[in-house]
Structures are given as C-alpha cells and as structure tokens.
C-alpha cells in the first residue's frame, strides 16, 4: 500500500542530523489550523538548493522522507511539474465521429 | 515479509535508564520514516517518538522530550530508543512502527502500517 | 496539540449486527481535501494492526465489513456485519505532519 511518485532526496547536510523538529509546519486551512504557529527553524531546501526546482508547481519538502517533491499546478505533470497534459477532447471527439 | 523484533526492554529502578532495539527486515528500511509507540498496562496507545528516514529529524511528545533519545543505523537495519531519567509512568510496552506512506500530487499521506511485537519496560523500586 | 476523542467508550453488539465507533477531533484533520486519520485494530496479547488510512482507504487485507468515513473534526469507523472475531479494541489515529501524532483514547467491542 505504499506508492511514491515525484520524490528527490536533498544532499544530505552533516550538522542537520543533531537537529530535532518539535514545531509543526503543515499549513492548514480555516478555523485555528496554522494560526499561532512559529515556523520551524530549520532550512528548508525549497528555500535554498531547490528553489527553482519545480517549474509550474509548488515545491514541497517531507521530513518524514528527507524529501522534495512538487505539488504540480492544473494540467503539469511530471518529477518537476515540467510536462503538460495533452488533454483530448473526448467529447467534442466522439460527436465529430457520429 | 516485513519483520520489526524489539528488544531491550526489563526492569529499571526510577531514575535509571534503559535502550530499546529494533531489528527491521523484509524492506528497504532507510526508504521509511519510524517511530515508537507504548502502551501502559491496560490503557491506550502512545506515540512516544519519529525519525525521518536519514536520521535528520526527530519528533517527540512533551511526556518525553529531553529524557528520550530516537536513533537509527540504517547499515544495520535498526531503530533504537535510548531512555534516561525513567519514572515509573513509563512503565509499558514498547512499540517499534513502520511509516507506511502515500505520495501524490505533493501530498503526504503516513500511517503505521506495520508493528513489532513490543517490549515490556518497567520502571519499579 | 490536536485532541481525537473517541466513543462509545465501549460497546457491545450481536453479531450480524452494525458497529459504529466515531472519533472527535479537536480541530481540523483536513488538508485541501485529505483528512489525516487512521483506524487501528488491538485484540488482546497483540499489538496494533491498520485497518484504515486518511479515513477510508482500507488496508491490504482487512475485510469488506471494515469502512471508514468522515472528513474535517468528524470521522467513524463501521463495521457491518459484526464477526465474533472483531473483539478487540479500536483506535483512531491523526497523522498531520504536526507532531504530536495523537491516538484516541480506544473503543471496546464486544460481541454478544
């Protein structure tokens, strides 16, 4: 049950590994989520080394999996949101060929 | 098949400490982020601590920051918890998990999805 | 530090019988749509095994009977029909990125 797409592992940094993560970053929606909430202050790699990495999307670090992923924007796909979807027309297809 | 053996787990007096071991086999062990969970006789589950698949980040509840130290040598395939300053309410099982997970579209989906046996600590004068 | 409050606390039910188990949480579990909750089975001398992830999604291996629903601070487990089998007691699980990863504080089922 475990499938992974999109995923780049980050060099790994040495003087990382004493850090501990006891703030919380996900961002969240409504009500009270993500309020009152301090940043952690570790660097985050899609601030630094993959900033540009994902070119239509939004980069994504996972620290649970040491990883940088992108969250691609409508109709981009791919390991860095780089390739589009050539959307068929299915519909408008299937009439032309009644 | 996924195994998770822990081990290390007896009797200590208030105060002292203790070192949980898990052996992990049957995956990619450095591929997964993992954690121990405990359970205290008769009561409900705990998470007690994560660390990220390198080792980079740690995660722990208030209950235990400071006294409990999460580790992994993924050359060895193993997962440990070093715990100082014991009281006697951490007098449980041990559990080692796997982060069983999903990635899509930039999102992050985990969930244990695999358990050790456990190991009993109790801490007693 | 989100909150998950399950209930009943327990529960006894025949089997053939429909079990429902909710779980409350403190605050939103959602994140554009996903909701980061799990379902856990204990039966006694065990440890825990998954049954559901982010709410529905049923493990490998977990019989028909076993559902998941629900999505923001709402989420419950069903099973239906009740086997004799099911005994045991069930926890809900957030798994957000924000520690701490709280359970619920556990259901008790019964059979008849």
């Known amino acids: 049950s475990v499938r992974v797409e999109q995923v780049v592992k980050p060099p790994q940094n040495k003087t990382e590994s004493e850090n501990t993560s006891d703030k919380p970053k996900r961002k969240k929606k409504g009500g009270k989520n993500g309020k009152n909430r301090r940043n952690r202050k570790k660097k985050n790699p899609c601030n630094a080394e993959f900033q540009n990495f994902c070119i239509h999307g939004e980069c994504k670090y996972i620290e649970h999996l040491e990883a940088v992923t992108c969250k691609c924007q409508q109709e981009y796909f791919g390991e860095r949101c780089g390739e589009k979807s050539m959307k068929t027309h299915s519909m408008i297809d299937s009439s032309l060929s009644k | 098949e996924v195994q998770l053996v822990e081990s290390g787990g007896g009797l200590v007096k208030p105060g002292g400490s203790l070192r949980l071991s898990c052996a992990a086999s049957?995956?990619?062990?450095?591929?997964?982020?993992m954690s121990w969970v405990r359970q205290a006789p008769g009561k409900g589950l705990e998470w007690v601590s994560t660390?990220?698949?390198?080792?980079?980040?740690?995660y722990y509840p208030d209950s235990v920051k400071g006294r409990f130290t999460i580790s992994r040598d993924n050359a060895k395939n193993s997962l440990y918890l070093q715990m100082n300053s014991l009281r006697a309410e951490d007098t449980a099982v041990y559990y080692c998990a796997r982060h069983g997970y999903l990635l899509y579209d930039g999102y992050y989906e985990w969930y244990f999805d695999y358990w050790g046996q456990g190991t009993l600590v109790t801490v007693s004068s | 530090d989100i909150v998950l409050t399950q209930s009943p606390a327990s529960l006894a039910v025949s089997p053939g019988q429909r079990a429902t188990i909710t779980c409350r949480a403190s605050?939103?579990?959602?994140?554009?749509?996903?909701?980061?909750i799990n379902w856990y089975q204990q039966k006694p001398g065990q440890p825990p095994k998954l049954l559901i992830y982010a709410a529905s999604n049923k493990d490998t291996g977990v019989p028909a009977r076993f559902s998941g629903s629900g999505s923001g601070t709402d989420f419950t487990l069903t099973i239906n029909p009740v086997e004799a089998e099911d005994t045991a007691n069930y926890y809900c699980q957030q798994s957000t990125e924000d520690p701490p990863y709280t359970f619920g504080q556990g259901t008790k089922l019964e059979i008849k």
């Open positions: 660390i990220s698949t390198g080792g980079s980040h740690t």
């Open positions: 049957g995956f990619t062990f450095n591929s997964y982020a």
């Open positions: 605050e939103s579990v959602d994140y554009d749509g996903h909701s980061f």
